[in-house]
């Protein structure tokens, strides 16, 4: 299944105490999947879409994060045939650090 | 349903501040993101900055670095942006946006701000 | 920043003409593309998110595709309605930044 999209959601923290809101969104044909966000190949929060919708944003409170952050990936996990949970690659790596900087 | 309703045109002399409003109903203010965008008359549109309601957090585009204030008030549901220092430049259209986690879905009616002398 | 060139920059079609417009990222955007859709004196309103996804109660001639830095958006019939000032938008990164737009006539 192909991987999906990742990006750090604005506004970007300017502080470890900052909280850290990650999007994560799967190709259009795979609404309402069951969504895990990794820091360092840890699992750090899991998110299910709206079955209407491609994708979550993940919402990581201040504080709760070494810092410098990163890198997270995120994958989602959609039912395939036989009811049997089929997972996607990983998607891209998203860095964080303080403050982060503008393009 | 979820709207966005900013506050009414303004003719401002230059050198002048201008703060327009947008105020926020129909889902929970406080887990949003908004953005502003600007467009001045016969123009494309122009990312301004966001702020996070829920701590103030803000990003700015570095064009109005300086010159420009987003804040918001929680209590009832509004977000603020103001520029100082105005120019003839800065007329445009201003409008407030909603982020969610795929862009910018729901956007304010616009609020007009003419700079004239 | 990253730059959003959109073409052509206006084009004149008739009702129920197929339209594609077209807009390049400056680098890789992966699907973070939106496409607006405005009319004189209104907020831009969303049309198609993730590049492909059709925002809802927008009608089904409106369709997007591509991925990276290349994306395109079709109106398979156009209407009367749809005639319009298009936009397309990266948000993968701040500055958020939007293509110059297409002002799609009726010829």
């Known amino acids: 299944i192909p991987a999906p999209s990742i990006r750090l959601v604005p506004p970007y923290p300017s502080s470890q105490e900052d909280p850290i809101h990650i999007a994560c969104m799967a190709p259009g044909n795979f609404p309402g999947a069951n969504f895990t966000l990794y820091r360092g190949g840890q699992v750090v929060q899991l998110l299910q879409a709206p079955t209407d919708q491609r994708g979550v944003t993940f919402n990581l409170s201040g504080g709760s994060s070494k810092a410098p952050g990163g890198p997270f990936h995120c994958q989602y996990g959609v039912l395939g045939e036989l009811n049997q949970s089929q997972l996607s690659d990983l998607s891209e790596p998203v860095n964080v650090s303080f403050p982060v900087p503008t393009w | 349903q979820v709207q966005l309703v900013q506050s009414g045109a303004e003719v401002k002399k230059p050198g002048a501040s201008v703060k327009v409003s947008c105020k926020a109903s129909g889902y929970t203010f406080s887990g949003y993101g908004m953005h502003w965008v600007r467009q001045a008359p016969g123009q494309g549109l122009e990312w301004m900055g966001i702020i996070s309601p829920s701590n103030g957090n803000t990003n700015y585009a570095q064009k109005f670095q300086g010159r420009v204030t987003m804040t918001r008030d929680t209590s009832i549901s509004t977000a603020y942006m103001e520029l100082s220092r105005l120019r003839s430049e800065d007329t445009a259209v201003y409008y407030c946006?909603?982020?969610?986690?795929?862009?910018?879905?729901?956007w304010g009616q616009g609020t007009l701000v003419t700079v004239s002398s | 920043d990253i730059q959003m060139t959109q073409s052509p920059s206006s084009l004149s079609a008739s009702v129920g003409d197929r339209v594609t417009i077209t807009c390049r990222a400056s680098q890789s955007i992966s699907s973070w593309l939106n496409w607006y859709q405005q009319k004189p004196g209104k907020a831009p309103q969303l049309l198609i998110y993730?590049?492909?996804s059709l925002q809802s109660g927008v009608p089904s001639r409106f369709s997007g595709s591509g991925s990276g830095t290349d994306f395109t958006l079709t109106i398979s019939s156009l209407q009367p309605e749809d005639f319009a000032t298009y936009y397309c938008q990266q948000y993968i990164s701040i500055p958020i930044t939007f293509g110059q737009g297409t002002k799609v006539e009726i010829k």
């Open positions: 946006a909603r982020e969610v986690y795929y862009g910018l879905d729901v």
């Open positions: 993730g590049a492909s």
